[in-house]
């Protein structure tokens, strides 16, 4: 038994055919000590007297709010709830599994940006007598706050005879640091109470695979003279992180008719325009997605190709480009060749997600993700990495940076990968271990040397840990990457010459 | 299944124009863009233009253009491609294609080889 | 016009091996970049489209990477009927072009 809140109570129960249940004693929260009577919810039949009560728990009857008397006079309350664990797996009965995406996901979190805020929501057939309530942290063993709000309930749909009910909540974190690379992972757990049965569910992740921009706005159409083609063009969405030059999105662009079936036209790009074929009664549409990181795209922003005019959606700046002043050229170092450091840099995003694509879909947090790959160099918040710290002194990032890939470059060189089972040269793995050095020697010319970080050794010894492990290394790349992208594209398009 | 049959073997002299057909089956006609991708002897492929069956669109690479038109005739689901002023260098062999995406090509015909000499 | 540029022109491997193709575009076309695969006397067959997206009915040895200017295909594990020409082509605007191709040779 444990204390959820103040005077409710948690009984947790193997739930099976005659088992014995708990023995639970409640003390009566009072000074007094004779004449003390207990009763169960709204029933007047005394159950025991004194000031503790023992009973044992078996099943839900046992459960609700016990309540200790003196003389008619209401002493305390304890609330007892039940948590059934069925076969070793706690019940999961309140929550609908939303099997996406996969199963056993009962909440799923999105966030529009990478400023710490996110929204979680879950679905239920319930709808009386619940309540959840949200707690959140980055990490688990040393955490650091996030806050929540009140869960609310945010739909409600009919699904066949069924009515469907979604809650959402928003948590921010509260020392966020958008433009770091997350080491820990979010934590979210919801407790849920519907009657006097008690569930808890949590989520683990990171606010960079969550991501999923809102559409692109104010999508505007140009007709081109003597041609069937249209420019159109758009804006990156007011919730985007900012500046989009650190912060950048890729785009797709689609002619559909109203039917999925019919012809289509699809392009995708970098810019915040592209041309495209219009036909009469299709529509144009532009979806974003994060340019370094394989994220969720965004839903669709659409325009009909007959209107030329604008969609819904205000003014704002789009593009990539960065604003404000030029950077100023790097004390105490030369500035490095950020255009082609750019260049190698998204290739390296490329690779990184094509080495093992089914990285981004597995779920390794439960393989014990912080004792393998907590030795892994991290872009932390203190790294000067952000687009204030690269206009300050930019050295101190591309130190970092140099040392990220350097250390990669020796892991993806070492047994992990080079043992069983064997991967050849020229695998998207070979190719990228020859880009993470190419990009290191890009920041680190002959003669000018900074300290390099200890590989660690991690030498698995059967081939499926070796495999374990790289999918590992391999997603910890891929957000590296991502963050060293976003600086050097940051760099081209402010501190260049 | 969806299938492009083209038009025999074309032998031309410099100067003529020459007319390929390309004759689609196993799906709606208007639902796909028809491509023409020609092929020189031993060389690479060149995209030539697109056609919209369902209203006549048309699009063609700059190198073609005043020199191409493409046609279709929906109740036989037959796709034309005219080439005029040959020249001994439009000696290729000529394939139509057929996408619902417009800017790749995902069914081929068989190709009409088309010779030009005089 | 956006120019394609395939490397090597041939490519001699021996049947097993892994065989990594090239293209590379004359400015950034994001990753529109299709893969194509012709053998002698026959009309060309799309492998990959949109640089990584498979196609089905086609063996998975057959993979396509690469974003911006620089692009891949890698036959993982070449079989007897893989020797033929592939061809990558630019769909990020009119006109469309593809490049020289790349022949692929048994050693």
């Known amino acids: 038994i444990w204390e959820l809140k103040k005077d409710v109570y948690v009984v947790e129960l193997d739930w099976y055919p005659d088992a014995p249940g708990e023995m639970v004693v409640l003390t009566c929260d009072t000074p007094e000590e004779d004449g003390i009577t207990w009763t169960l919810d709204q029933s007047s039949e005394v159950l025991g007297s004194g000031k503790t009560l023992t009973i044992q728990v078996k099943e839900f009857g046992d459960a609700g709010q016990y309540t200790c008397h003196k003389g008619g006079e209401v002493l305390s309350h304890s609330l007892l709830l039940l948590h059934k664990k069925e076969d070793g797996i706690w019940s999961t009965d309140i929550l609908k599994d939303q099997k996406e995406p996969k199963n056993k996901t009962f909440l799923r979190c999105e966030a529009k940006n990478y400023s710490g805020r996110f929204t979680c929501w879950w679905l239920t057939t319930i709808s009386t007598d619940l309540t959840f309530s949200v707690k959140s942290s980055r990490g688990s063993s040393d955490p650091q706050g996030v806050t929540c709000g009140a869960a609310t309930l945010s739909a409600e749909r009919v699904r066949g005879d069924n009515k469907e009910y979604e809650y959402s909540v928003e948590c921010q974190e509260d020392s966020a640091c958008p433009a770091a690379e997350e080491s820990l992972p979010i934590e979210v757990m919801v407790d849920a109470v519907h009657k006097l049965k008690y569930e808890n569910y949590t989520s683990s992740f990171f606010i960079r695979d969550i991501i999923k921009p809102d559409p692109p706005k104010n999508l505007q159409l140009k007709p081109l003279k003597n041609s069937r083609q249209v420019e159109v063009s758009w804006e990156y969405p007011d919730t985007w992180s900012t500046p989009h030059s650190y912060f950048s999105l890729t785009f797709c662009v689609q002619v559909q008719g109203k039917s999925k079936r019919e012809k289509a036209d699809r392009v995708f790009t970098d810019k915040t325009s592209a041309t495209v074929i219009c036909r009469k009664n299709a529509s144009i549409s532009v979806r974003a997605q994060d340019r370094y990181y394989s994220s969720s795209w965004s839903e669709w922003a659409s325009v009909p190709c007959s209107g030329s005019g604008s969609s819904r959606g205000g003014s704002g700046s789009g593009g990539s480009g960065g604003g404000g002043s030029k950077l100023r050229a790097v004390p105490g170092g030369s500035s490095p060749a950020w255009t082609q450091c750019q260049q190698l840099s998204q290739k390296l995003c490329t690779l990184a997600w094509s080495a093992h694509p089914l990285v981004g879909h597995m779920d390794l947090r439960e393989e014990g993700d912080e004792e393998t790959t907590n030795d892994v160099p991290h872009i932390q918040c203190g790294d000067g990495c952000d687009p204030q710290g690269l206009r300050d002194n930019s050295q101190f990032c591309l130190q970092r940076i140099h040392q990220g890939l350097i250390f990669y470059e020796k892991l993806l060189g070492s047994d992990i990968f080079t043992g069983e089972p064997s991967l050849l040269p020229d695998s998207p793995v070979g190719q990228l271990h020859a880009s993470l050095l190419g990009l290191s020697q890009l920041l680190q010319p002959e003669g000018h040397h900074w300290e390099t970080q200890q590989i660690p050794s991690l030498s698995p010894s059967q081939p499926w840990q070796r495999l374990l492990l790289r999918f590992k290394i391999l997603r910890s790349l891929q957000a590296f990457v991502a963050v060293a992208a976003r600086v050097f594209a940051h760099g081209a398009a402010t501190l260049s010459p | 299944q969806v299938q492009l049959v083209q038009s025999g073997a074309e032998v031309k002299k410099p100067g003529a124009s020459v007319k390929v057909s390309c004759k689609a089956s196993?799906?709606?006609?208007?639902?796909?863009?028809l491509h023409w991708v020609r092929q020189a002897p031993g060389q690479g492929l060149e995209w030539m233009g697109w056609?919209?069956?369902?209203?006549?669109?048309?699009e063609y690479a700059p190198k073609f253009q005043g020199r191409v038109t493409m046609t279709t005739d929906t109740s036989t689901s037959t796709a034309y491609m005219e080439l005029r002023s040959l020249r001994s260098d439009d000696t290729a062999v000529y394939y139509c294609?057929?996408?619902?995406?417009?800017?790749?090509?995902?069914?081929w015909g068989q190709g009409t080889m088309v010779t030009v000499s005089s | 016009e956006i120019v394609m540029t395939q490397s090597p022109a041939t490519l001699s491997v021996s049947p097993g091996e892994r065989a990594t193709l090239s293209c590379r575009a004359s400015q950034s076309i994001s990753i529109n970049l299709h893969w194509y695969q012709q053998k002698p006397g026959q009309a060309p067959r799309l492998l990959i489209y949109f640089a990584s997206q498979s196609i089905s009915g086609i063996p998975a040895r057959f993979s396509g990477s690469g974003s911006g200017t620089e692009f891949t295909l890698t036959i993982s594990s070449l079989q007897s009927e893989d020797f033929a020409v592939y061809y990558c082509?630019?769909?990020?605007?009119?006109?469309?072009?593809f490049g020289g191709g790349t022949k692929v040779e048994i050693k």
């Open positions: 082509q630019q769909s990020n605007s009119f006109p469309l072009t």
């Open positions: 056609i919209d069956p369902e209203n006549g669109d048309t």
């Open positions: 294609n057929a996408n619902k995406e417009l800017r790749y090509f995902d069914v």
């Open positions: 196993g799906y709606t006609f208007t639902d796909y863009y």
